[in-house]
């Protein structure tokens, strides 16, 4: 007869049935709430392993928030109390570099990473004797899912991996440790679509538990890069999807990040939002923007969670989140991670390990200041972690948290044992905190990054810089040749210079029309299904970027394919970064670029710039002495005062913080 759980194991080529033993006086009946620490004996491939687990106290918040919708479409905010949750991390006794991410909610479920193998464990269905199945993650059948274009070097890399024993991840990270010793915190928000919710039997608790489990798995993978995953929110589209999910992965990703910027950021601060979808995209497991983790408009990804386990799905989310964190695909690069394939391999391999290339890519992001939002330790009301002094997260009731007693010896402002400020200190961390004191109001804490940005200043009574704002989308820039879009002046010449060096400039319009009408990887208006879209003549300026006067060939850690097309007496240069189908192509014209009179590029189409809803009459609203910012408030020139730039003052806006210090006006400059 078929064993109980036959269906459960249909995706496995090999597995064992085991009975774990809890190392306490009672055999299994754990008291509720769940223990902070627990140990088990488990068997795998003829060996007994002792595993030590500790509740992952950094994972979930005191006020864990879940957003859902009622039948009328009204937003419902719920704060389920899950302080004493059942999600653990740990290690295998005597196994160097081992790590574990397990839940102990209804039996043991999770991942064990040993030196040269990863195992999955889950309760055997219908067993009354605490039986579990344990299996190598390599033995999970996976439909071939891709995250990029094919690459001939993949076979070469795999062959090489089998010949020589690669160094361990710890050794790799020890070699290059310029930035990685500093812990980074990714404040993650997860959105679950309607179809996935339906697939889970419309059970909100089940969806919530599964996503917490997912976050615990992600944390166990990212910890090797000294990155902590903090789940700051979950939204379930219980009443219907709030974006259009028809079309290709690129369309859905675009729709999702637009929705995120408009509706989600204002509700809950976070660094990256990941959409979990049931619907697939013809073999593409997910898609995300590269290096955009701190971006207001593009810090997101989409991830397909169909008929696979949450353990396998975790590597997809880790991969797409990795893109947000600046990581490119490993294919064709000299990367190793101590396993046959790594998380950032384009083939959605189900790996649990990040490669040396991923560590370097992330390091580049941080060195280029692309990861500044990851430095803040989540605030008490934003971090989903059961309060615990010493976890380096400032929890509710804490004023600071410097970590372990050893780390706290180096902190002059924070009392390590109590997580309170020392008696003389006003603050212990933050952009506006120096030597345990608030920096004076008017101290610049976030400079202007482009002609479409505005600076922010400390307010004198907080350790935090004012929230980031920029000039309102649609404001003319570059002498009326372009528009501001998400804090950048988007114009063709600047994009060409980023890719092809300072002498490059936009090619004539004929180049765009000729190349982008082809509908191939070098000239297209995006991707539809499995093929490139040809650009209609009216949209050609929003397809692949075409440049001329090229004197430098780009090097971005990944060598792109460059195409040169002769056209009417000039050479049009274009580039294909071959980052894979799950990554938006940086060789395309940027969104927000002016493609005609009163028109901008959006979703590879040249559309009416009215979609930006630019509504600022600077003469009337700001009296000709300022511009409107992204909150639609006047940012005044130096010499004029907010809110309306009518009276004399020191510039700035109601959002920027004071631009001067009454005690020392020299700070203004």
């Amino acid at each position: 007869a078929a064993r109980p759980g036959f269906q459960q194991t249909s995706h496995l080529s090999s597995y064992e049935i085991i009975t774990p033993w809890r190392l306490t006086r009672e055999r299994r009946e754990a008291p509720r709430p769940y223990s902070k620490q627990v140990s088990y004996v488990i068997q795998a491939e003829g060996k007994e392993h002792i595993i030590h687990l500790e509740r992952n106290k950094d994972l979930l918040p005191e006020d864990f928030v879940v957003y859902t919708y009622n039948k009328e479409g009204t937003l419902i905010t719920d704060h389920p109390n899950i302080q004493n949750h059942c999600h653990y991390r740990g290690y295998v006794e005597g196994v160097h570099n081992s790590s574990i991410a397990l839940s102990d909610c209804f039996g043991l479920r999770g991942l064990l990473h040993l030196e040269n193998a990863s195992y999955g464990i889950e309760p055997l269905q219908n067993s009354s004797h605490f039986e579990h199945i344990i299996y190598r993650m390599d033995d999970v059948y996976k439909e071939p899912l891709k995250c990029g274009v094919s690459n001939k070097d993949i076979e070469k890399e795999t062959a090489k991996d089998e010949e020589e024993e690669p160094p361990s991840m710890t050794q790799l990270l020890r070699r290059r440790r310029a930035v990685l010793p500093q812990t980074r915190y990714v404040e993650l928000f997860i959105v679950v679509d309607k179809e996935r919710y339906d697939m889970m039997g419309r059970n909100q608790t089940a969806v919530r538990e599964e996503m917490i489990l997912l976050a615990n798995y992600l944390d166990s993978m990212y910890i090797m890069l000294n990155i902590r995953i903090v789940l700051v929110g979950l939204e379930i589209w219980t009443n219907g999807n709030l974006i259009n999910i028809v079309g290709g992965a690129g369309d859905v990703l675009g729709n999702f990040v637009q929705w995120r910027e408009k509706f989600l950021i204002t509700r809950r601060r976070h660094d990256s939002a990941q959409l979990v979808l049931k619907k697939g995209f013809g073999g593409t497991a997910g898609m995300a923007f590269v290096g955009t983790v701190c971006s207001r408009s593009h810090a997101g990804g989409i991830n397909v969670f169909g008929q696979i386990t949450v353990e396998t799905f975790a590597s997809i989310v880790a991969h797409e989140l990795g893109h947000n964190l600046g990581m490119n695909h490993d294919d064709g690069r000299d990367c190793s991670c101590g396993a046959k394939s790594c998380i950032m391999n384009s083939g959605a391999s189900g790996s649990r390990n990040f490669s040396s290339c991923s560590a370097e890519d992330f390091e580049k992001l941080t060195l280029n200041k692309g990861g500044n939002c990851l430095l803040n330790i989540p605030k008490p009301d934003e971090a989903y972690s059961a309060p615990s002094c010493g976890n380096k997260l400032v929890d509710a009731g804490e004023e600071c948290d410097c970590g372990t007693p050893k780390e706290c010896e180096l902190d002059p402002c924070c009392e390590g044992s109590t997580c309170k400020l020392k008696s003389f200190a006003e603050c212990a961390y933050g952009d506006c905190c120096k030597d345990c004191r608030f920096l004076p109001g008017g101290t610049l804490c976030r400079g202007k990054t482009s002609e479409c940005d505005v600076p922010e200043y400390c307010n004198g009574s907080s350790q935090f810089c004012q929230p980031d704002v920029f000039i309102q989308n649609g404001y003319p820039c570059q002498n009326n040749k372009a528009y501001c879009y998400n804090g950048m002046c988007q114009y063709y010449d600047a994009q060409c210079q980023v890719i092809f060096g300072s002498k490059a400039k936009a090619a004539p319009k004929d180049c765009f029309i000729e190349v982008n009408s082809k509908g191939d990887r070098f000239g297209n208006c995006g991707f539809s299904g499995n093929e490139y879209k040809k650009c209609a003549t009216g949209n050609a300026l929003c397809g692949k970027l075409q440049c001329e006067n090229v004197q430098e060939i780009p090097v971005f850690g990944i060598v792109p394919a460059i195409i040169q097309t002769p056209s009417r007496g000039t050479k049009c240069w274009g580039v294909d970064f071959q980052l894979g189908s799950d990554v938006p192509d940086p060789g395309m014209v940027n969104e927000g670029t002016k493609c005609g009179a009163g028109k901008i590029c959006r979703n590879f189409q040249c559309v009416d710039a009215s979609v930006l809803n630019y509504d600022c009459d600077v003469q009337k609203k700001c009296h000709g002495h300022g511009v409107c910012n992204s909150n639609k408030n006047c940012h005044c020139e130096n010499g004029w005062a907010p809110p309306n730039c009518e009276t004399k003052g020191y510039g700035g806006s109601v959002d920027s913080g004071p631009t001067y210090n009454e005690m020392n006006t020299a700070l203004r400059d």
Epitope: G538, L612, D617
Partner: nanobody, 120 residues
Framework: EVQLVESGGGLVQAGGSLRLSCAAS????????MAWYRQAPRKQREFVAS???????TYADSVKGRFAISRDTAKNTVALQMNSLKPEDTAVYYC??????????????WGQGTQVTVSS
Amino acid sequence: EVQLVESGGGLVQAGGSLRLSCAASGSIFSSNTMAWYRQAPRKQREFVASIMTDGTITYADSVKGRFAISRDTAKNTVALQMNSLKPEDTAVYYCNARQYGEYWQAAGSWGQGTQVTVSS
């Protein structure tokens, strides 16, 4: 200057349809971008759809696939066909005419608006 008069608003059930019309008087209708905007209570006015003189049609993401804009140059009218209406489409809808290349909300001529209410 173009004078604009909207019509066709009213009360409709969620999932229903309405057709708004905007009649323009003045001789420069054909050289104008025609657009529809809307303003819900306590919200800022927002772009809905436009049709430019070169034929470019643009929709706000929130109405894409549900609304359709069209113009009849001979009759100096622009219409907005609204299908699969949702409660959040409730607003005063305004017709706007502006010169080609203008895109900011202060530009051009505006109608008085027509109220659309979608009940659940």
